[in-house]
C-alpha cells in the first residue's frame, strides 16, 4: 500500500477503562495530531478506518462491528464499546485515508478489573481539596457524551467502599459531591457510579478519584527559615568541617514552585572556587506543607572561608526571605605556661 | 447516655439580649458533628437558625440570623452557646440545640428545648 | 434559598389508613432531604434520612421515597401514636456562592378522623 503518515504508538495516551462498562474512545488524531477536525476530514472525502492488534499478538486485525447488540460501533471519531470485553485489551489504530492522503496512529486500551469495593489496577486522577475552606466540590469525570442531556442517569457516590449517605460533612449533589468542611480524614478515594438506561438496557459507568486535603491558601505564609538563625553560631577551627543546614519551611499553595539556595559572598556555590557539596532533603506534612532542608559543606575550611557571607534564601508564589548565617573562627584556648621561678631565695 | 440539655431561655424586653447554653453529655464536642440551634414559634413551624461544626469551630447561619446571632462553643465545657442581640418580638420561641441537622445523618439528636419570651 | 412545600398543611385520617404526604423542593436537592415527627410539647424525632433511609427504631410502615424536587413519606398503616406533625427538611448547596441552604417544610398535621 502507498505511504502513511505513521505517528506510531501513543503511549502517553494510556487508556483504561473498566471491563463491563461502556467506554467511548476519540481517535487521537484530531485531538493531537492533526489541524483540522473529523468533519473537516469527513467533508473533504476522508475515511476514517478502526482496526487493532490483540494484547499479546503482532497481527493487525479489522474490528468486527457486527457483533450482537452492537457491542462495538463507530460513530463520527468516536469508537464506542457497549460494554468492554476483558480480551478488547490491545492497540488499537485508526487511520484516515483517502487515495491521495493517509495518517495514522496507535494507541494502547486496556480493560481492568475491579473488585466490589472499586479496587483496580486503574491509574487515578488526584483532586486536592483546601482544609477547613469552606464549600468545595468534586464531579464525576469522564461522563460527557455517554448519553443525551434528555437522560437522568441516577449517580451513587461512594467513599471507598462505603455509599455516603451518612456523612455529616459530605453531600452528594448529582454529578458532584459537596465538601462542606474538608478535613484530612477525608482524605481516600471517591466513586461515583452513574447509572443510566439505552435501548432497554442499563448500563454503569465507575469512575474513581483520590481526594487529598491540602493546606489551605487562607493559611499560607511566605516561607519561613527555622535555621539558620540567631542562635545558632558556626564556631570552627580551620581544617574543620563547615556544615551549615538550611531549613525552609513552605505552607502548600497549589503549583507554587518552592526554592531553596545558599549564596556564598552574593554568589551561587557553583560561580566560586572553594569546594563546597549541597545535599536537599524534602518532607511533606498530612497537608502537603514542605520542609526542605539543604545543608552546605566544606570538608576542610579555611580561614578565608570562615569570613564569608552564607546566605540561605527562599522563594515560593508568597515571597522571597533570606537568612545569613553566623560563622565565625575558633579563637585558640590561651596556653598557659608555667615558668618556674628560681634564685629568689634570700640573702 | 447521649443527650443535649438547653438552658437559659427567658423573658426579656424587645432590644434586650440572651445568652442560650446546650451541655451535651455522652459525646465530645472534639469529635465531628454539626450542633444547630433550632426555633419553634408558639403553634409554628421550625426553623433553623445557625449550626457550629464542633472539631473545628466553622459555623453557618440562616441569612435573616446572620449579624444579630452568634453561635459559639466551648469544647472544653462540651457545651454549645447562641448569643441573641436586638430580641423582637418575632424571636418569641422554644429554641432547640440538634446535632447533625445541618446534613442529617442517622445521628441525629435534640434537646428538649429552652422557652425565649420577649415582650415589653 | 430553597423553599420546601409541603402538603397537605393537615389531614384526617383512621388508624389502620394508609397516609402519604408530600414536600416539594423549590430546586434540584437530589436525595438530600429528612422527615421529622413531632408531638405536642417535644422535640422533633428523626424518622427517615437520604430521602428513603429509615432512622434506627423507627417502624417499617413509615417509608420515605423521591429525589430531586418531589418528596414523599407514607405511613403505609397508620397506628394511634402516629397521630402528630411532620416536617420535612431539604438541604442544598449553591454552586454559584458557595452556599449551603436548608429548610424546613411548614408542617403536616395528621389527626385523628
Known amino acids: 500500500s502507498e505511504r502513511c503518515d505513521d505517528w506510531g504508538l501513543d503511549t502517553m495516551r494510556q487508556i483504561q477503562v473498566f471491563e463491563d462498562e461502556p467506554a467511548r474512545i476519540k481517535c487521537p488524531l484530531f485531538e493531537h495530531f492533526l489541524k483540522f477536525n473529523y468533519s473537516t476530514a469527513h467533508s473533504a472525502g476522508l475515511t476514517l478506518i478502526w482496526y487493532w492488534t490483540r494484547q499479546d499478538r503482532d497481527l493487525e486485525e479489522p474490528i468486527n462491528f457486527r457483533l450482537p447488540e452492537n457491542r462495538i460501533s463507530k460513530e463520527k471519531d468516536v469508537l464506542w464499546f457497549r460494554p468492554t470485553l476483558l480480551n478488547d485489551t490491545g492497540n488499537y489504530t485508526c487511520m484516515l485515508r483517502n487515495t491521495t492522503y493517509c495518517s495514522k496512529v496507535a494507541f494502547p486500551l486496556e480493560v481492568v478489573q475491579k473488585d466490589s469495593c472499586f479496587n483496580s489496577p486503574m491509574k487515578l486522577p488526584v483532586h486536592k481539596l483546601y482544609i477547613e475552606y469552606g464549600i468545595q466540590r468534586i464531579t464525576c469525570p469522564n461522563v460527557d457524551g455517554y448519553f443525551p442531556s434528555s437522560v437522568k442517569p441516577t449517580i451513587t457516590w461512594y467513599m471507598g467502599c462505603y455509599k455516603i449517605q451518612n456523612f455529616n460533612n459530605v453531600i452528594p449533589e448529582g454529578m458532584n459531591l459537596s465538601f462542606l468542611i474538608a478535613l484530612i480524614s477525608n482524605n481516600g478515594n471517591y466513586t461515583c457510579v452513574v447509572t443510566y438506561p439505552e435501548n432497554g438496557r442499563t448500563f454503569h459507568l465507575t469512575r474513581t478519584l483520590t481526594v487529598k486535603v491540602v493546606g489551605s491558601p487562607k493559611n499560607a505564609v511566605p516561607p519561613v527559615i527555622h535555621s539558620p538563625n540567631d542562635h545558632v553560631v558556626y564556631e570552627k577551627e580551620p581544617g574543620e568541617e563547615l556544615l551549615i543546614p538550611c531549613t525552609v519551611y513552605f505552607s502548600f499553595l497549589m503549583d507554587s514552585r518552592n526554592e531553596v539556595w545558599w549564596t556564598i559572598d552574593g554568589k551561587k556555590p557553583d560561580d566560586i572556587t572553594i569546594d563546597v557539596t549541597i545535599n536537599e532533603s524534602i518532607s511533606h506534612s498530612r497537608t502537603e506543607d514542605e520542609t526542605r532542608t539543604q545543608i552546605l559543606s566544606i570538608k576542610k575550611v579555611t580561614s578565608e572561608d570562615l569570613k564569608r557571607s552564607y546566605v540561605c534564601h527562599a522563594r515560593s508564589a508568597k515571597g522571597e526571605v533570606a537568612k545569613a548565617a553566623k560563622v565565625k573562627q575558633k579563637v585558640p584556648a590561651p596556653r598557659y605556661t608555667v615558668e618556674l621561678a628560681c634564685g629568689f631565695g634570700a640573702t | 447516655q447521649v443527650q443535649l440539655q438547653e438552658s437559659g431561655g427567658d423573658l426579656v424586653q424587645p432590644g434586650g439580649s440572651l445568652r442560650l447554653s446546650c451541655a451535651a453529655s455522652?459525646?465530645?464536642?472534639?469529635?465531628?458533628?454539626?450542633i444547630c440551634w433550632v426555633r419553634q414559634a408558639p403553634g409554628k413551624g421550625l426553623e433553623l437558625v445557625a449550626c457550629?461544626?464542633?472539631?473545628?469551630?466553622?459555623?453557618w447561619y440562616a441569612s435573616w440570623a446572620k449579624g444579630r446571632f452568634t453561635i459559639s462553643r466551648d469544647n472544653s465545657k462540651n457545651t454549645l452557646y447562641l448569643q441573641m442581640n436586638s430580641l423582637r418580638a418575632e424571636d418569641t420561641a422554644v429554641y432547640f440545640c440538634?446535632?447533625?441537622?445541618?446534613?442529617?445523618?442517622?445521628?441525629?439528636?435534640w434537646g428538649q428545648g429552652t422557652l425565649v419570651t420577649v415582650s415589653s | 434559598d430553597i423553599v420546601m412545600t409541603q402538603s397537605p398543611s393537615s389531614l384526617s385520617a383512621s388508624v389502620g389508613d394508609r397516609v402519604t404526604i408530600t414536600c416539594q423542593a423549590s430546586?434540584?436537592?437530589?436525595?438530600?432531604l429528612a422527615w421529622f415527627q413531632q408531638k405536642p410539647g417535644q422535640a422533633p424525632k428523626l424518622l427517615i434520612y437520604?430521602?428513603?433511609t429509615l432512622a434506627s427504631g423507627v417502624p417499617s410502615r413509615f417509608s420515605g421515597s423521591g429525589s430531586g424536587t418531589e418528596f414523599t413519606l407514607t405511613i403505609s398503616s397508620l397506628q394511634p401514636e402516629d397521630f402528630a406533625t411532620y416536617y420535612c427538611?431539604?438541604?442544598?448547596?449553591?454552586?454559584?456562592?458557595?452556599?449551603?441552604?436548608?429548610?424546613f417544610g411548614q408542617g403536616t398535621k395528621v389527626v385523628i378522623k
Open positions: 455522652g459525646f465530645s464536642f472534639s469529635s465531628n458533628y454539626w
Open positions: 457550629i461544626y464542633t472539631s473545628t469551630g466553622n459555623t
Open positions: 430546586e434540584d436537592i437530589y436525595s438530600n
Open positions: 427538611l431539604g438541604v442544598c448547596t449553591d454552586i454559584s456562592t458557595d452556599d449551603l441552604y436548608n429548610a
Open positions: 437520604g430521602a428513603s
Open positions: 440538634a446535632r447533625d441537622l445541618l446534613v442529617v445523618t442517622s445521628f441525629n439528636l
